[in-house]
Every structure is written in structure tokens, then in C-alpha cells.
């Protein structure tokens, strides 16, 4: 399983779709900006084994899928782009699950530790609570879209670390 390449290509396609989903100017929503506290340390490529990287990516993508597959999200975005985004996320999830299947035979290392996962989940909880507090306004969704783009970009740090190890 060529994880860095698989994930990198999927990530890029997901980022392009997220960019295309933007409906309103980010500048008109500056008053709604918020620091969600992305757990950057979780995606520090130097501390990862391959199995942990797989589960870190998966966690990020699954939580993003959960966030964007709600009724409120469907109302906020263009349906065609949203479906393409779902397909991209779903494909990445499948690829990552297949990576675990393929890792059998080599010594199976533990998946990502619980603290790291909880940090990612709490980050997404903060995003959900922010959206609820803002009553899922167009600007709130725009802020969240930009935030997810940023967090997807951060995971490239992990890819670089993995490439060095490979």
C-alpha cells in the first residue's frame, strides 16, 4: 500500500472540491472567524508508524464526512459538489481500510493512540458546537469550509514524514 501517494492524491482532489464549494467571500465573514484549535501535534510526521498514520488520516476523513453529511450541511452546499466530495472521502476511507488489510503479515503495530484520536474528535466537536451556536449560518459554514481546507493541508506534514521513512 503506497500510503503517501494514495492519500496525497485523494487529499488534493478533496481540497479542490472544498475550494469549489465556496459560495461567499471569506472576507465578508471575517467577524465570524474562530480558532478551533486544530491538534497539529497529532499530524507531526516524525512520530508515526505507518499503521498509526493510516488511522490518523482515517479519523480526520471520517469526522469530515460525518460533519458534511448532516441535513444542515446538505442545505448549505451545492448538492453536486457535495456528492463529489462524499465520493472522494468515501474512496479515501476505503483505500485506508484496504491498507490495514494489506499490512497483515508484517508485524501489526498498534493503531493511533486514544489521546490523539480524542484530540481529533474534540476538534470536530468544537466545529459542530460553533456551527450550532451560529445557527448554521452561511458565514459559519464558510469559516468551517476554510478551516477543513487548512486541516487537510496540515496532514501533508504527516505524508512528508512517511515519505522520508519509506
Amino acid at each position: 500500500c503506497d500510503l503517501p501517494q494514495t492519500h496525497s492524491l485523494g487529499n488534493r482532489r478533496a481540497l479542490i472540491l472544498l475550494a469549489q464549494m465556496g459560495r461567499i467571500s471569506h472576507f465578508s465573514c471575517l467577524k465570524d472567524r474562530y480558532d478551533f484549535g486544530f491538534p497539529q501535534e497529532v499530524f507531526d510526521g516524525n512520530q508515526f508508524q505507518k499503521a498509526q498514520a493510516i488511522s490518523a488520516f482515517h479519523e480526520m476523513i471520517q469526522q469530515t464526512f460525518n460533519l458534511f453529511s448532516t441535513k444542515d450541511s446538505s442545505a448549505a452546499w451545492d448538492e453536486t459538489l457535495l456528492d463529489k466530495f462524499y465520493i472522494e472521502l468515501f474512496q479515501q476511507l476505503n483505500d485506508l481500510e484496504a491498507c490495514v488489510t494489506q499490512e497483515v503479515g508484517v508485524e501489526e503495530i498498534a493503531l493511533m493512540n486514544e489521546d490523539s484520536i480524542l484530540a481529533v474528535r474534540k476538534y470536530f466537536q468544537r466545529i459542530t458546537l460553533y456551527l450550532m451556536g451560529k445557527k448554521y449560518s452561511p458565514c459559519a459554514w464558510e469559516v468551517v469550509r476554510a478551516e477543513i481546507m487548512r486541516s487537510f493541508s496540515f496532514s501533508t506534514n504527516l505524508q512528508k514524514g512517511l515519505r522520508r521513512k519509506d
Epitope: 471520517q62 453529511s69 476505503n94 481500510e97 501489526e108 486514544e114
Partner: antibody, heavy 126, light 110 residues
Framework: EVQLLESGAEVKRPGSSVRVSCRAS????????ISWVRQAPGQGLEWMGR????????NYAQNFRGRITITADKSPLTAYLELSSLRFEDTAVYYC???????????????????WGQGSLVTVSS | EIVLTQSPGTLSLSPGEGATLSCRAS???????LTWYQQKPGQSPRLLIY???SRATGVPDRFSGGGSGTDFTLTISRLEPEDFAVFYC???????????FGQGTKVEIK
Amino acid sequence: EVQLLESGAEVKRPGSSVRVSCRASGDTFSSYPISWVRQAPGQGLEWMGRILPALGVTNYAQNFRGRITITADKSPLTAYLELSSLRFEDTAVYYCASPSADIIPSILGTTLFAFWGQGSLVTVSS
Amino acid sequence: EIVLTQSPGTLSLSPGEGATLSCRASQNVSRHYLTWYQQKPGQSPRLLIYGGSSRATGVPDRFSGGGSGTDFTLTISRLEPEDFAVFYCQSYHSPPPVYTFGQGTKVEIK
């Protein structure tokens, strides 16, 4: 916590079709697959197929291809199993089952069935 | 396609005794993708162990899972009266996603 509620028992003739529904409530996500698993009387569990409601993407077990159709509605989150060309050996309890969003890490979540419906008995009899 | 074979078919034991149930796969399975369920008569299955060795919420610590490759075990350290049931192992393989169950092991009161 997710609750799965299936439709009632059915009696069908050989060669006919049956449609079983499964309504999900609680902490549901259309981004997690819903599966159908059946159990013939006194027998073990057999996975039939699954659907990802957000996309309508389906995967079917080899044994059922050509006879099975799984569909879903996103709101309220409901999955449907349709099995055609029924045979006597299709007499079974049909369960819908789903993963849990709470499983850590999430990569394990879709590989298992954390929540199960109460089961729907389908009897094929002439 | 992976085949899971559980043994023994039936285990007759008394409360307080320990039980070891085996699940053998026809080819290598990731321990992360091996799950155990308990099913009592007239009830739906209940998730017990996932990821090979992690206990599901509310599952007592007398239940433990282990193994890797093709050989997996479910151990019940001291059987309680409510533990007597049928136990199933299940694996997941991708792509395409396929879920496979073992035929079950019945743990009955001696």
C-alpha cells in the same frame, strides 16, 4: 447510541420478493454503512450486503448477487432490503446492523456491527 | 474468500470455570479487523470484542480477545450464569468490503 427498528414478520411464497425496512434513530450518520445480516433457524449469521446512505453505494455478498437490492433514504435514515426469487432456504430472521461512531479509532468502526435491529422473521412457505 | 472456522462447536462448562474459544481463518486476517459477538436465544447479537482485543462498552473484563494472523481466541476467565450463549467471530476484508462470520461456538451449562 443508535436504535434500529425493523419492519414486522412476513410470510412469502417461493419465487416472490420480500422488502424489509430498518429505521435508524439516535446518534445516526448517513456517512456510516448499514448492513443486512440474516440467520436461518438454528443456524449462524450471514452477511448479505451493505449501503452507505450518504451516497447510495452498495456492496453485496457473492451468494446474493442478482437477487438482492439494498436502498436507503437519508431522512429519516432508513435502509431497505429487497430479496427476490425467494426459496424455502431464505426462511430466516433478517437483521439490520450498523457500526458505532464511538469506536476508537474510527478505522475499526465500519468493520464491525455495534448496533443491531430486533430482527424481522421472513418465512417462505407454499 | 476468507472462511472462519470456530472450535469447539459446543463447550459444556459449569459457572466459575474458564472458557477458551478458537477462531481460525483460512488466510491471514488483520487482528484489527477481528470481532467477537455474543448471542442469547431469541435475542440479537451483541458486540463483545473488536480490534482483536478491545472490549466494547459495558463488556465485563472477564472477556478478553487475542491472537493474530490466522488464529484468534476469545477467553472468558470465570463463567457467570449470564455468559452462556453462542459466540461468533467475524472478520472484515477490503476491498471490496466483505464481512465473514464463523459458524459459532455454543457455551452451555454442564
